[in-house]
């Protein structure tokens, strides 16, 4: 996997054990906590960076489910089950036995059961909608020029295809971010929308995920977009299977 | 095979427009960014901007913002740029390039266009 | 708006030389890309994030650096590489190029 040579790091994973011990004395990067060896040209999976963030852990964060089909991360940070390709598997399972599905991105998408709990498959999030409330300024942002920088830090700064990007939105102090990518659009080699909008995420907390750059500078035409809150919906390809009981909580 | 074609060489008065063409092939053509550079002869690369062909979306460079207007026609997968008001200093070669996770992968051949009166 | 300085301007060398192009950027970027124009043609990508060989670019060019210092390196000079090289950042817009680097033979 390759990785900055000269010092053996990981440009697109901080959270990562480097060494020149790959095949010619690459150097080789491994995810702290599952020990995986990463691909350093490309963003890490959320499973891998999930499961290195609780091997050093931090608060919790909590999120509000807005709505009847999109999901959000109601249940904060735990330490994911990852397959050998680094995704998230379909079960999850916590250390008193009590499992749940996920989707692609890691959401819980059902009731928490136990250990006969059955999940066939893993349900893909083809759509994400990132909402953010950007601090007050002295006028509105130009629309034109706020949608081509988010498109712009999401092509150069997260490798996602423009094609992925949807939509701009924008009602002053409002910004949305639509991201899509069905299983048949995604192509060997491209960024997952999970990972990139989990990396803007970070970003925006400024907890940057990248190794040795500067943390998120957002400008519109030099003026800072400074970000006050964040939200991000999930929409599954397979509607969330969640009981009666939770819909009219 | 990504291919951009451009329109052939202008000869225009000061003050006049010029609109140069880029035909796409080999590609889906809403999937990606076309950006537009200039060359002076003799001189540097100039980027001017880019659209997103998928949503339309545009970025001028501050210095040609309100003398160029980019578009985009996904029926025949060709983008265009327009330059207003032209003055001798514009005389360049004119490239459109594509754009996708990276800036600019590949690229036109070139349109030159000479301003004089 | 991010400067690029390229150093030198100009380089007169021969075939077999080793030749190094500097470019250095005014703020730090994420990643430098290097491309390479021919007289009457179109640049060519050369190198992308700083140091990942473009699709058929030879093994003779690499690219290092980080930050606000990047490196173009060819190891041996061919006759076919003498032409004028720029460096690029798009971490910010606009997007902007070094004034570029004339390799020529000496």
């Known amino acids: 996997h390759t990785a900055a040579q000269d010092n053996c790091t990981c440009p697109t994973n901080k959270m990562t054990v480097c060494s020149p011990d790959g095949p010619g004395g690459r150097c080789q990067c491994r995810a702290l906590g599952s020990g995986m060896a990463v691909d350093c040209s490309t963003l890490t999976s959320k499973c891998l960076l999930l499961k290195a963030r609780m091997s050093a852990p931090k608060n919790a964060r909590t999120l509000v489910r807005p709505s009847e089909h999109a999901l959000v991360d109601n249940d904060g940070l735990y330490d994911p089950d990852c397959d050998p390709e680094g995704r998230f598997k379909a079960r999850q399972c916590n250390q008193t036995s009590v499992c749940w599905c996920v989707n692609s991105v890691g959401v819980r998408r059902t009731d928490k059961g136990d250990l006969s709990l059955r999940c066939d498959e893993l349900v893909r999030t083809h759509h994400i909608l990132i909402d953010l409330r950007h601090r007050p300024t002295a006028g509105a942002f130009n629309h034109s020029d706020l949608d081509a920088e988010l498109r712009r830090l999401f092509r150069e700064r997260y490798r996602l295809h423009p094609k992925f990007v949807a939509a701009v939105h924008y009602e002053q102090p409002t910004i949305q971010i639509e991201l899509r990518q069905n299983t048949s659009q995604k192509a060997a080699g491209d960024v997952d929308i999970g990972d990139a909008a989990y990396y803007f995420e970070r970003d925006i907390k400024g907890e940057s995920l990248f190794q040795g750059r500067g943390g998120l500078d957002l400008r519109v035409r030099g003026e800072p977009l400074q970000v006050e809150r964040t939200l991000i919906y999930y929409l599954d390809e397979i509607p969330p299977k969640f009981s009666m009981k939770r819909l009219t909580a | 095979e990504v291919q951009l074609v451009q329109s052939g060489p202008e000869v225009k008065k000061p003050g006049a427009s010029v609109k140069v063409s880029c035909k796409a092939s080999g590609f889906t053509f809403t999937d990606y960014v076309i950006g537009w550079v200039r060359q002076a002869p003799g001189q540097g690369l100039e980027w001017i901007g880019e659209i997103y062909l998928g949503s339309g979306t545009i970025y001028y460079t501050e210095k040609f913002k309100g003398r160029v207007t980019m578009t985009a026609d996904t029926s025949t997968s060709t983008a265009y740029m327009e330059l207003s008001s032209l003055r001798s200093e514009d005389t360049a070669v004119y490239y459109c390039?594509?754009?996708?996770?990276?800036?600019?992968?590949?690229w036109g051949q070139g349109t030159l266009v000479t301003v004089s009166s | 708006d991010i400067q690029l300085t390229q150093s030198p301007s100009s380089l007169s060398a021969s075939v077999g030389d080793r030749v190094t192009i500097t470019c250095s950027a005014s703020s730090s970027v994420s990643y430098m890309y290097w491309y390479q124009q021919k007289p009457g043609k179109a640049p060519k990508l050369l190198i992308y994030?700083?140091?990942t060989l473009a699709s058929g670019v030879p093994s003779r060019f690499s690219g290092s650096g980080s930050g606000t210092d990047f490196t173009l390196t060819i190891s041996s000079l061919q006759p076919e590489d003498f032409a004028t090289y720029y460096c690029q950042q798009w971490s910010s817009y606009p997007y902007t190029f070094g004034q570029g680097t004339k390799l020529e033979i000496k």
């Open positions: 390039a594509r754009g996708s996770i990276f800036p600019f992968d590949y």
């Open positions: 994030d700083a140091s």
